[in-house]
């Protein structure tokens, strides 16, 4: 019963985690404009892995995709790759774990096969969670580096009096979603691995020997516990705008009070 609960909980936690990783990957708020010096701004910038957005005080939001692949920073590409790998592994892990669930009966699948699949999905969830945490952490590190670099050059004098303010970016909501989601996926994976141990049938290749000593009855089993991981020969393996003068009709921006484009 405890094994089923652990496995089921691990599955649910991992499912929530992977949904969070997908959400974080799709979110536009990976980095948001730092508002420390100006809490109320007329133009607010935020960026995601796939596009950057500008929300005006008027309520209009305009988002632009990164249509270049080669022109993007290597770090951003690496973060994208880590998140996608995390999602793919997580999705496969979910698929495997569905069949591994003790509460689901599929033909005459043995417990050893279910244990094997539970462990496989658990490892996949762990790697998926680590990929997400790594991706988010790499991006966060990139932000911190850029933040202090832009703080050093915050105001660049142009002809004495004129000042150009460099936009600084800080952690966006997606980073926190990613960290939490990665952590949940990781925890779910660990729970699946724990559940795998309970699912695995105990093998006893010996006879129990009883020793009787002065009034006490003690049973002694030599050899200790042997858990079948299912990777032996006895297992049955079962096999996601430009410049220039323009009229307003040429401008594509959308009002966004309720949702962000």
């Amino acid at each position: 019963m405890a094994v089923t609960a652990c496995q089921g909980l691990g599955f649910v936690v991992s499912l929530i985690g992977i949904a969070g990783i997908i959400a974080a990957t799709c979110m536009d708020q990976w980095s948001t404009q730092d508002l420390y010096n100006n809490p109320v701004t007329a133009v607010f910038n935020y960026q995601g892995l796939w596009r950057s957005c500008v929300r005006e005080s008027s309520g209009f939001t305009e988002c632009r995709g990164y249509f270049t692949l080669l022109g993007l920073p290597a770090m951003l590409q690496a973060v994208r790759a880590l998140m996608i790998v995390g999602i793919v592994l997580g999705a496969i892990g979910l698929l495997v774990s569905i069949f591994a669930l003790k509460c689901i009966r599929i033909g005459s699948m043995e417990d050893s096969a279910k244990a094997n699949m539970t462990l496989t999905s658990g490892i996949m969830f762990i790697v998926s969670g680590l990929c997400a945490i790594a991706g988010v952490s790499v991006f966060a590190n990139m932000l911190v580096t850029n933040f202090w670099m832009s703080t050093a050059n915050m105001y660049t004098g142009m002809g004495g009096m004129v000042q150009t303010v460099q936009t600084r970016y800080t952690f966006g909501a997606a980073l926190f979603v990613g960290w939490v989601a990665g952590g949940l996926t990781l925890i779910g994976g660990v729970m699946m691995c724990i559940a795998c141990r309970g699912l695995a049938p105990e093998e006893t290749n010996y006879k129990a020997v009883s020793y009787h000593a002065s009034g006490h009855s003690v049973a002694y089993k030599p050899g200790g516990f042997k858990a079948s991981t299912g990777f032996g020969s006895n297992t049955k393996n079962k096999k996601i705008y430009d410049g220039g003068a323009r009229t307003e009709d040429e401008v594509q921006s959308y009002p966004s009070k309720h949702d962000y484009v």
Partner: antibody, heavy 118, light 113 residues
């Protein structure tokens, strides 16, 4: 069509308060921020502040903060600007204006003249 | 606060001639997020509220004649009336829409020579 209709001219004594209204029609009232602009006689334009009719959030020019209050009545699609502790330099035409792309003001009310005189 | 400085204060141009006025901001109005300049131009005729001509420094509002052209980037901006008409006699204001408080220039008065 979009229309912003403001209340009539007001004459007030120094130290008093004035509440100017701006009724919007012809568009989704909660979809656009409303701004207030002051124009003293023979002078230029001065931004007072704005209000988001959807959330009710406000932004004020520090120069007017503490003396000006912007409020809304969604049921009548009306925005109000209340200016307290009036002084002679508050004598001006006050405009309400709808905020558009680029934070520009695309539609303006006809203006309300407020005269502060003892 | 961003200070907007307009020049000249007044401008007398013959009908059909080109009228050019400038606007300088104390800080860049170019937003790095979308590479747009948050500068707006308005026209105000006596006894009337201002009328929006150009936003994002160069985008004409629909219904505005194409003789009105906005240009510039960063801190220096220009409004050009390619062929002045009698109805263009007015005061023209530029506005910072990038940073609060939103600020206006002192205005340029355009008259017929």
């Amino acid at each position: 069509q979009v229309q912003l209709v403001q209340s009539g001219a007001e004459v007030k004594k120094p130290g008093a308060s004035v509440k100017v209204s701006c009724k919007a029609s012809g568009y989704s009232f909660t979809g656009y921020n409303m701004n207030w602009v002051k124009q003293a006689p023979g002078q230029g334009l001065e931004w007072i502040g704005n209000i988001d009719p959807y959330y009710g959030g406000t932004s004020y020019n520090q120069k007017f903060k503490g003396r000006v209050t912007l409020t809304i009545d969604k049921s009548t699609s009306t925005v109000y600007m209340e200016l307290s502790s009036l002084r002679s330099e508050d004598t001006a035409v006050y405009y309400c204006a709808r905020m558009y792309h680029g934070n520009a003001f695309d539609y303006w009310g006809q203006g309300t003249t407020v005269t502060v005189s003892s | 606060d961003i200070v907007m400085t307009q020049s000249p204060d007044s401008l007398a141009v013959s009908l059909g001639e080109r009228a050019t006025m400038n606007c300088k901001s104390s800080q860049s109005l170019l937003n790095s997020g979308n590479l747009k300049n948050y500068l707006t131009w308005y026209q105000q005729k006596p006894g009337q509220p201002p009328k929006l001509l150009i936003y994002w420094a160069s985008t004409r509002k629909s219904g505005v004649p194409d003789r009105f052209t906005g240009s510039g980037s960063g801190t220096d901006f220009t409004l050009t009336i390619s062929s002045l008409q009698a109805e263009d006699v007015a005061v023209y204001y530029c506005q910072n829409d990038y940073s609060y408080p939103l600020t206006f220039g002192g205005g340029t008065k355009v008259e017929i020579k």
